[in-house]
């Protein structure tokens, strides 16, 4: 009778992460008597995947009923495959021995390769807000994909950006990979409604590329412009002075009126109006009793926007 051969018909198998891998193995004879074991890798450091005789292997099921006397199919299924499962799997026949079974013959091996989708890209911007004309950096990260080949593009409001640097790690062979990209974006005053998008394309993606977004509203600070104007003199010697605070973002703003350098009133922007570009306008007024002053009055509108150093605009009120 011919000596037993262990046949692994598949040289290689490709499986998607999360799916089940079937590793096929048949023996050509029932003799010698003894169990089958599956290993990942060869040599002394090989990893036991399944032992017909003993042990608990929750992810592994056999294709056939191995308890049947005449069974020669030793194929297994491994569930919920991850990239970490990649490697060469060997079906090994052991001969019954005492005290231990003896390795008799190994199959040629089946190389299991795993394809895994990239995670949804996460885009993060700078920790602190920046003002128009400044360049800010955004990062995009996606993890866990295989194979290594991946494309990443950056867009601002649908326009592709070119000033970015991308790295895929690790550089050498690995079970899965990560991508990290940093893009530089120049802010403009109109960017409150703008979006920065990182787009990742990979062989495993059946839909459009995966996208991660960042709203520039979380990054930009548009400082206000101030204008102080004097309204016509009202009855009882009262003058209405207004401070127009225009085109600022975000809304967080505190205004202080000073009369000749002395604090007259402080208020916080509340009923603001929003411009089309997402910035805000606000107006504050001050009633000044002219008769209470002998000399000219210097009125100052002082604005502290989003925790930044105060900016101010003054107006000289003539007392005639």
């Amino acid at each position: 009778e011919e000596e037993l051969q262990v046949i692994q018909p598949d040289k290689s198998v490709l499986v998607a992460a999360g799916e089940t891998a079937t590793l096929r193995c048949t023996a050509t004879s029932l003799i010698p008597v003894g169990p089958i074991q599956w290993f990942r890798g060869a040599g002394p450091g090989r990893e036991l995947i399944y032992n017909q005789k003993e042990g608990h292997f929750p992810r592994v099921t056999t294709v056939s009923d191995l308890t049947k006397r005449n069974n020669m199919d030793f194929s297994i299924r491994i569930g919920n495959i991850t990239p970490a499962d990649a490697g060469t799997y060997y079906c090994v026949k052991f001969r019954k021995g005492s005290p231990d079974d003896v390795e008799f013959k190994s199959g040629a091996g089946t190389e299991l390769s795993v394809r895994a989708k990239p995670s949804a890209p996460v885009v993060s911007g700078p920790a602190a807000r920046a003002t128009p004309q400044h360049t800010v950096s955004f990062t995009c990260e996606s993890h866990g994909f295989s194979p290594r080949d991946i494309t990443l593009k950056w867009f601002k409001n649908g326009n592709e950006l070119s000033d970015f640097q991308t790295n895929v790690d690790p550089v050498g062979e690995s079970v899965s990979y990560s991508i990290h990209s940093t893009a530089k974006v120049v802010l403009t005053r109109e960017d409150v409604h703008s979006q920065v998008i990182c787009e990742v394309a990979h062989v495993t993606l059946q839909g459009d590329p995966l996208r991660g977004t960042a709203n520039l509203s979380e990054t930009i600070r548009v400082p206000p412009t101030l204008e102080v104007t004097q309204q016509p003199v009202r009855a009882e010697n009262q003058v209405n002075v207004t401070c127009q605070v225009r085109k600022f973002y975000p809304q967080r703003l505190q205004l202080t009126w000073l009369e000749n350098g002395n604090v007259s009133r402080t208020e916080t922007a509340s009923t603001v109006t929003e411009n089309k570009d997402g910035t805000y306008n606000w107006m504050s007024w001050l009633l000044v009793n002219v008769s209470a002053h002998r000399d000219d009055v210097k009125l100052t509108c002082q604005v502290e926007h989003d925790g930044q150093p105060a900016v101010s605009k003054s107006h000289d009120l003539k007392v005639s």
Partner: antibody, heavy 116, light 109 residues
Amino acid sequence: VQLVESGGRLGQPGTSLTLSCTVSGFSLSSYVMGWFRQAPGKGLEYIGIISSSGSPYYASWVNGRFTISKTSTTMDLKMNSPTTEDTATYFCARVGPLGVDYFNIWGPGTLVTVSS
Amino acid sequence: DIQMTQSPSSLSASVGDRVTITCRASQSINSYLAWYQQKPGKAPKLLIYSASFLYSGVPSRFSGSGSGTDFTLTISSLQPEDFATYYCQSWHYISRSYTFGQGTKVEIK
């Protein structure tokens, strides 16, 4: 799992023609689908794909000559202004479950003849 | 665009022969290469994907190898039903476009 093309016929140059690919056994919202053609006695040529979410992508030579769209169970290929050069058997195909780099399910094809 | 050059364009062989068809890409496509078999009046059938993986139901006499720019389809022992035209097809991960080789017709000697 099955794909069947329809709409192939004898058409006049310049008169638009729409081919359909009807799918069964799977959902078009889960797979990338492609259109290909093969002129008589010639090789296979890629026309374009439509993603699972419905975005079309075309071969560089297409230049607006074809439009790919889909509904829940059919994928269409509109030939916008066909010429005699567009005479071919048109195939639809589905990409494999492991990735978009190969096509594992093909329809039998439908013949389009453009002639005056 | 990537060009795929298949060779030979045709070959004559006998049943039992070992047949090798090659495909060369004009630039690296890594392992994104598929092989199809097509018979007259029929749709292409997938044989090999990702350069070396045998599609389910395809006889093990078919095998694929290669990566980068050079790829090979081997039929270890030609059978009567294998007489057909074979196409390679690439996918480029940057352009996300597909290109076919011009085909190899395998005829009976």
